[in-house]
């Protein structure tokens, strides 16, 4: 297993609709053809694999399971979007990148993006 640098923004504010997007960029030492990206949430004394995707370079990301994430890839960048977030989902979201093929296997883990989610205030009653 070889180490690899992964960069991601320090802070992101989710939209009022509970959507947060950020870029995860990795310094690929070679020409990887199969890449796996995992988003981890570290908060509340827990580590959770929020979503994971494997993709072949140049192809769409295929997320595993019932994913709340979507994403696209461009070169060594992955644009990740997490949906359905609420205030309680605020936390540190860490990007983990694995170069699966061809060998050697590379692993990189970012420092994390602190995602802040603010639940929208309910609209006041109106006579109109």
């Amino acid at each position: 297993c070889k180490a690899m640098h992964v960069a991601q923004p320090a802070v992101v504010l989710a939209s009022s609709r509970g959507i947060a997007s950020f870029v995860c960029e990795y310094a690929s030492p070679g020409k990887a053809t199969e890449v796996r990206v995992t988003v981890l949430r570290q908060a509340d004394s827990q580590v959770t694999e929020v979503c994971a995707a494997t993709y072949m370079m140049g192809n769409e990301l295929t997320f595993l399971d019932d994913s709340i994430c979507t994403g696209t890839s461009s070169g060594n960048q992955v644009n990740l979007t997490i949906q359905g977030l609420r205030a309680m989902d605020t936390g540190l979201y860490i990007c983990k990148v694995e170069l699966m093929y061809p060998p050697p296997y590379y692993l990189g883990i970012g420092n994390g993006t602190q995602i802040y989610v603010i639940d929208p205030e309910p609209c006041p009653d109106s006579d109109f």
Partner: nanobody
């Protein structure tokens, strides 16, 4: 709901290992996120680990991360908790639970509506 029954608990020395099993009956097992919780005497029930419906995504409490591994076999309607390097503070009754919901960011708070009877794990020095 599904019916759940745990097994595999017992007495083990510090640093030892155990593998807990949880068998499900009733509804379609693969529709449920599965979790393991534990409760020590005089303490609240606490989240240990959870696994998504297909088994591809997992969540762990910091206190067990790197020592415990959750897994599942949908064909056998089984969930497992492999516990290594056990510590005195791991002693508790361990429960498996099922939540009829998809994965998300906080599986410890999912609406687990089915619970097993629990299996006792005792770690001694």
């Amino acid at each position: 709901e599904v019916q759940l029954m745990e097994s595999g608990g017992g007495l083990v020395q510090t640093g030892g290992s155990l593998r807990l099993s949880c068998v499900a009956s009733g509804r379609t097992f693969s529709n449920y996120t599965m979790g393991w919780f534990r409760q020590a005497p005089g303490k609240d029930r606490e989240f240990v680990a959870a696994i998504s419906r297909s088994g591809s995504l997992k969540s762990y409490a910091d206190s067990v991360k790197g020592r415990f591994t959750i897994s599942r076999d949908n064909a056998k309607k089984m969930a497992y908790l492999q516990m290594l390097f056990l510590k005195l503070e791991d002693s508790a009754v361990y429960y498996c639970a099922a939540a009829p919901v998809p994965w998300g960011t906080r599986p410890s708070t999912f609406p687990y509506d089915s619970w097993g009877q629990g299996t006792q794990v005792t770690v001694s020095s």
